[in-house]
């Protein structure tokens, strides 16, 4: 019987779960050759995107880890992480504490007029405390980042502040006014909850809004600063003091970046010098006549920052504000996030090294890591082979490109320290889990800040991850020439050592290939490859643009095709490379399996798995995204791949079997 020679069904629980997932999300009554997005995602259109679903699964896993009763070594990182999580979940204690802990913080900062008691303290003392002890930056942001000329040298960066309201430079007056109106209502609620006299609260909240509004007016748009060469300006602390004298830069920065030793001649990177000048003038103006309002503005800002650590009245006020602001900016309402999720995220932020080790131990064991590395190697080899056959690359460029791939480092699952338990077993000696949840949060904020500074000060640190191991976003770091695939991404339904290889190559493999192609994004920019056959490259470029432009857009979907070109190229190329790697794998190794009752061949499962990654509901935000809308991310690459039409037997001229195709990668 010839049937027995074919791929056998995978009947393990992971395969059956995946089959059920595919059956639940797909709509097999749709013709795959005309609308594969609906074929794969038809029933899932209204649900979260597949990445969000996976992120939630990972958080659930962290939750289970944190809720298991364990006898940890007293004072260990694990014990502190568990205590912190439990204290976050103990809403009864948080409610009972009420505003007491916060009032205590306000008193330490010198009080405020809103509730009567306030000592006319030194403005810079308050600012210094806010920055160094509370991680709150009311007038500008200060952080450690790579030196523009030497990415491995850390340097203090002074940047525009982050506003708590979704303001845009080109917003019409009406939206601007409504946003501030809602924010004013919110600030009034905060002041009243803290025992302020309503008319005094209104006066101070209104002035806080005015300060925010004026600071926002001073911001220069990124493009304007870039065009004027003012995005990275090297300035000493002394020069900064001259430009923006209202701020005691040396003492504020010294306190914030302890144990760094700063001097007036210390160089910093400033991202908007003009903003800092204007901000300083505003502060000086207010220090003359309205010092108490300036204090209220800083404290209200801190209260907003700390509100997630406060009782339900503060949470509810915040939730209402977010809801109103989303309505005003025409965003869909945010689904309510359960308390456990907030607590998992907070614990993850403050105790990342500890949670990373626990997560990786449970979700990314040695066999999973080994399978993921094998998959990556297969993808990398396919890319190297492919680079030899690109018509727009001459031999010199091909060699350079191959060297670049060969020198690439990969970090799979978690960064090195998370995979070495002894390095991850941090003691967090400086964390005091206090009498109130707020005090615990503040202690964690200080500890985290100190750890960040310390990690920057270590000589030649390895690549500093931009994501946590349980996150679902892979990325390529240009400065470190490293590609990162967090453990959180390499999970079902995208990857599992026990899946049919078609699934792993189609889902995780195409993601890996996509990220690898970002190594070469520079080549695709105008003038980015002087040694290339630029005519051929330009042709491929235009072909791909036209190819994507030809697809019909679902109603109310918009996107900017000049923003999305590089991602589209990586999508199309990534699918082709993953398919090439998979085909080679099939030739060399027998014993492929399929998912039962789907009636799909291994190659069809490969494409189905690729599409599954892209399942999500289109959103209004797509117009600012560097990725195309989801259906285009499926149809663009599939229609560019002749094998798709072959394996799904698509008629010539069908949407996903066009008469001509483009090849960039």
């Amino acid at each position: 019987n010839f049937q027995n020679c074919g791929p056998r069904p995978c009947e393990t629980s992971v395969c059956l779960d995946l089959r059920d997932h595919y059956l639940a999300s797909g709509n097999t009554s749709v013709a795959p050759c005309t609308d594969f997005f609906s074929f794969a995602c038809g029933r899932a259109k209204e649900t979260n995107n597949s990445f969000q679903e996976l992120a939630t699964k990972n958080k659930n896993r962290l939750r289970r880890i944190l809720e298991v009763q364990n006898s940890w070594h007293p004072g260990s990182g694990e014990e502190k992480a568990f205590q912190f999580y439990n204290s976050c979940m103990d809403t009864l204690a948080i409610e009972a504490a009420g505003t007491g802990p916060l009032r205590q913080v306000i008193e330490e900062l010198g009080g405020w007029r809103i509730s009567g008691k306030w000592t006319s303290l030194n403005f810079n003392r308050t600012l210094r405390l806010l920055m160094s002890q509370y991680g709150h930056f009311p007038f500008f942001r200060a952080y450690l980042g790579p030196h523009p000329a030497s990415p491995h040298t850390p340097v203090i960066q002074i940047d525009q502040p982050e506003f708590d309201v979704p303001l845009k430079q080109d917003q019409e007056q009406k939206i601007y006014a409504q946003i501030f109106r809602e924010y004013l209502t919110y600030l009034n609620q905060l002041g009243t909850l803290l025992g302020g006299d309503p008319s005094k609260v209104q006066e101070h909240s209104s002035l806080s809004i005015s300060i925010t509004s004026r600071l926002f007016q001073f911001l220069r748009p990124l493009e304007q600063r870039r065009a004027q060469g003012k995005l990275f300006q090297m300035v000493t602390i002394d020069q900064l003091k001259e430009m923006a004298p209202a701020i005691d830069w040396l003492s504020c920065l010294q306190a914030t970046f302890t144990p760094m030793s700063l001097s007036p001649s210390q160089s910093l990177v400033v991202h908007d010098v003009e903003y800092l000048k204007n901000m300083s003038q505003l502060v000086e103006e207010m220090l003359l006549k309205q010092r108490d309002f300036l204090q209220s503005h800083m404290i209200l800002g801190l209260v907003v920052t700390l509100s997630p650590a406060l009782d339900s009245q503060f949470q509810e006020a915040r939730r209402k504000l977010s809801q109103k602001l989303r309505e005003l900016t025409e965003q869909p309402p945010m689904p309510a996030r359960p308390r456990w999720m907030k607590c998992v995220e907070e614990t993850g932020t403050f105790f990342e090294p500890t949670l990373a080790a626990l997560f990786v131990r449970e979700a990314f064991g040695p066999s999973t890591r080994s399978a993921a590395m094998k998959l990556f190697t297969a993808i990398r080899d396919a890319l190297i082979t492919r680079l030899r056959n690109l018509p727009w690359m001459n031999e010199e460029t091909q060699n350079m490109a191959q060297d670049k791939v060969a020198q690439l480092q990969v970090e799979m699952g978690a960064s090195e320290w998370a995979l070495k338990p002894e390095l991850a077993r941090q003691e967090y000696n400086d964390i005091q889990l206090g009498s109130s949840f707020l005090q615990s949060v503040l202690s964690c904020v200080r500890s985290l800040r100190a750890r960040i500074v310390q990690s920057f000060l270590q000589p030649h640190p390895q690549h500093r991850w931009k994501v946590s191991p349980w996150d679902v976003n892979a990325y390529y770091s240009v400065s470190d020439h490293v590609v990162v695939f967090p453990a959180g991404l390499l999970q079902p339904p995208f990857f599992h050592p026990g899946y049919p290889r078609a699934v792993n190559f189609g889902a995780a493999g195409s993601i890996m290939a996509h990220e690898l192609l970002h190594i070469f994004y520079q080549l695709l920019l105008p003038g980015g490859c002087l040694a290339c056959d630029n005519h051929a490259l330009q042709e491929a470029h235009l072909c791909l643009k036209r190819h994507y432009a030809a697809f019909p857009l679902p109603s109310r979907t918009s996107f900017n095709d000049s923003l999305t070109f590089l991602e589209n190229a990586a999508d199309v190329g990534g699918l082709a490379i993953a398919l090439q790697a998979y085909s080679k794998r099939l030739l060399r190794h027998h014993g492929e399996t399929v998912l039962p009752s789907l009636d799909l061949s291994p190659q069809q499962i490969f494409f189905r798995s690729y599409a599954q990654v892209m399942c999500r509901k289109p959103s209004p935000q797509d117009s600012h995204d560097t990725h195309s809308p989801p259906h285009l991310r499926v149809h663009g690459p599939l229609s560019s791949t002749p094998a798709f039409a072959r394996y799904f037997r698509c008629a010539r001229g069908a949407l996903l079997n066009p008469s001509s195709r483009c090849q960039l990668w």
Partner: antibody, heavy 120, light 107 residues
Framework: EVKLEESGGGLVQPGGSMKLSCVAS????????MNWVRQPPEKGLEWVAE??????????HYAESVKGKFTISRDDSKSSVYLQMNDLRAEDTGIYYC???????????WGQGTLVTVSA | DIVMTQSHKFMSTSVGDRVSITCKAS??????VAWYQQKPGQSPKLLIY???TRHTGVPDRFTGSGSGTDYTLTISSVQAEDLALYYC?????????FGSGTKLEIK
């Protein structure tokens, strides 16, 4: 002390042009949005034009009645805001006030005004 | 354009009285409303903004209230120096429009 001082008003014939100036002192002029508001004789107030900051690319807004006729501009180095008025008509007669925006809205400081009379 | 209607051109009151001046917007202006006082021969002065916030230095006998389309300026105990024209203004959207003004006269 915040001071706004308008000048340039006077008598002008219908169809004529005139440029009003307003010099500011007592505050960092370049940090504030500025406006012109007018008041016809024995009538109420009418907002005329607004100019924003350098960081906002000196964005301007006008009342419909003056669009295409009036131009607001500023010179931060001179702490001055101007209103160039062309093709003046009798209905443009009135006291013209220069005002400062405290934030994105409220006019918290006003000049003493300059009288513009459009008459044959 | 949004029309701000002050239905009373004049209001007559005595020193010590409580008086309320009203203003109606032709559409919801979301409390982005200011009140200005203009004394004879002088330029206007900002009294109230955000519909109910007193501007710095404004005596607390002046209070503002309202939301949506209806706004009120109240003087709790009128003083002789309050004799003036009072204007409401919306700053919700351009063009920023003023009411026609209410003249407060002392009996």
């Amino acid at each position: 002390e915040v001071k706004l001082e308008e000048s340039g008003g006077g008598l002008v014939q219908p169809g004529g042009s005139m440029k009003l100036s307003c010099v500011a002192s007592g505050f960092t002029f370049s940090n504030y949005w500025m406006n012109w508001v007018r008041q016809p004789p024995e009538k109420g107030l009418e907002w005329v034009a607004e100019i924003r900051l350098n960081s906002n690319n000196y964005a301007t807004h006008y009342a419909e009645s003056v669009k295409g006729k009036f131009t607001i501009s500023r010179d931060d180095s001179k702490s001055s805001v101007y209103l160039q008025m062309n093709d003046l008509r009798a209905e443009d007669t009135g006291i013209y006030y220069c005002t400062r925006n405290w934030d994105f809205a409220w006019f918290d400081s006003w000049g003493q005004g300059t009288l513009v009379t459009v008459s044959a | 354009d949004i029309v701000m209607t002050q239905s009373h051109k004049f209001m007559s009151t005595s020193v010590g009285d409580r008086v309320s001046i009203t203003c109606k917007a032709s559409q919801d202006v979301s409390t982005v409303v200011a009140w200005y006082q203009q004394k004879p021969g002088q330029s206007p002065k900002l009294l109230i903004y955000w519909a109910s916030t007193r501007h710095t230095g404004v005596p607390d006998r002046f209070t503002g209230s309202g939301s949506g389309t209806d706004y009120t300026l109240t003087i709790s105990s009128v003083q002789a120096e309050d004799l003036a024209l009072y204007y409401c203004q919306q700053h919700y959207t351009t063009p920023f429009t003023f009411g026609s003004g209410t003249k407060l006269e002392i009996k």
